[in-house]
């Protein structure tokens, strides 16, 4: 990926207006398209007072292991879809979607330097608080919380990822 | 002890411009994100955008941009807000407030009175 | 944009609970943030990060939230509770900061 592609806001906003419109679609099945059992995902509330002052490697932790726990969760749940005959076939459609857009988002932070600044310095990775995680389920809920990660701390991170490249 | 004081009240033409300080006193004036937030008589609060004091970079609110620019001057730890195009319903008392875990230091407010 | 809505005023009586809601769009999904503001003075903050409260706030004061609604409880209501309080969370959209628009708190007896 082209390092640089992220920061181009078109392209995250491509993938915020796919999760959001996964979520509206999942709004509308009964109990939220339950997924049978609970998936860990990332939390993604944000104190933005705290995260503004806070360093840009505690950031990239905070990312890329959400990205990496919400990447899971995503195939976890694209796996109990191919088991259940009860959910109706588009929503596969918008679970697939969302599996090869985090894949796609996580070439793209790696190209733009997250992983490596998630673990260098040693010191932004100890001292980042561990992930905390919420359980979600169904569809509606991981679609949600997908939404809000994209719109949350990863437009925040690449934002600011972006801006330190161009000086 | 930490606070923020702030310039005295202004009374303004529409269409004028005003600046308001806000000096801050007893912490690191670059450690700590300032935010400016507006009060109309009787009304609510209203944020108006923050300003990063370390390195000046700002983000406005959708309503007041095109007409409000946040500053500050390391060297006397002080903010500035100036808003342009002043109309009647400008009239407002405008808090600075610090930013920490939340807006934990606030300035004692600036009556800016907007009238003909 | 995002908005948060609350009640203009509430009303409870002295030594009981009042609740004052902040309704918004997921906003569960948030930290909200309390302020109370008394006449001529800066807003206060009471409630952090939904439920956290800074040192010098009584425990009497509490705040929840799910769904669409984040609460703000003070039990045990005194006199000295009357205010307006503010309720402010974070518009994901805009990165920008939003307040409700305030409730007027009255303590009755």
């Known amino acids: 990926a082209p390092a640089r592609l992220i920061c181009d806001s078109r392209v995250l906003e491509r993938y915020i207006l796919e999760a959001k419109e996964a979520e509206n679609v999942t709004m509308g099945c009964a109990e939220g398209c339950s997924l049978g059992e609970n998936i860990t995902v990332p939390d993604t509330k944000v104190n933005f007072h705290h995260w503004k002052k806070s360093e840009a490697g505690r950031h990239a932790v905070e990312v890329w292991q959400g990205l990496a726990l919400l990447s899971e969760a995503m195939l976890r749940s694209q796996a109990l879809l191919a088991n259940s005959s009860q959910l109706p076939e588009t929503l596969q459609v918008h679970v697939d979607k969302a599996v090869s857009g985090l894949r796609s988002l996580t070439s793209l932070l790696r190209a733009l330097g997250v992983q490596k600044e998630a673990v260098s310095p040693p010191e932004a990775a100890s001292s980042a608080a561990p992930l905390r995680t919420v359980a979600a389920d169904t569809l509606c809920k991981l679609f949600r919380i997908y939404s809000n990660f994209l719109r949350g701390k990863l437009k925040l991170y690449t934002g600011e990822a972006c801006r330190r490249g161009d000086r | 002890q930490v606070q923020l004081v702030q310039s005295g009240a202004e009374v303004k033409k529409p269409g004028a411009s005003v600046k308001v300080s806000c000096k801050a006193s007893?912490?690191?004036?670059?450690?700590?994100?300032m935010s400016w937030v507006r009060q109309a008589p009787g009304q609510g609060l209203e944020w108006m955008g923050w300003?990063?004091?370390?390195?000046?970079?700002?983000n406005y609110a959708q309503k007041f941009q095109g007409r409000v620019t946040m500053t500050r001057d390391t060297s006397i730890s002080t903010a500035y807000m100036e808003l342009s195009r002043l109309r009647s319903e400008d009239t407002a008392v405008y808090y600075c407030?610090?930013?920490?875990?939340?807006?934990?230091?606030w300035g004692q407010g600036t009556l800016v009175t907007v009238s003909s | 944009s995002y908005e948060l809505t609350q009640p203009l005023s509430v009303s409870v009586a002295l030594g009981q609970t009042a609740r004052i809601t902040c309704s918004g769009d997921?906003?569960?999904?948030?930290?909200v943030y309390w302020y109370q503001q008394k006449p001529g003075q800066a807003p206060v903050l009471v409630i952090y990060?939904?439920?956290k409260r800074p040192s010098g706030i009584p425990e009497r004061f509490s705040g929840s939230n799910s769904g669409n609604t984040a609460t703000l409880t003070i039990s045990r209501a005194q006199a000295g509770d009357e205010a307006d309080y503010y309720c402010?969370?974070?518009?994901?959209?805009?990165?920008?900061?939003?307040f409700g628009g305030g409730t007027k708190l009255t303590v009755l007896g």
């Open positions: 407030a610090r930013e920490g875990m939340y807006f934990d230091i």
């Open positions: 007893g912490y690191t004036f670059t450690s700590y994100y």
């Open positions: 402010q969370s974070w518009d994901l959209d805009f990165n920008t900061y939003v």
């Open positions: 997921s906003i569960g999904d948030k930290y």
């Open positions: 300003i990063n004091p370390l390195k000046g970079n700002t």
């Open positions: 990060d939904t439920n």
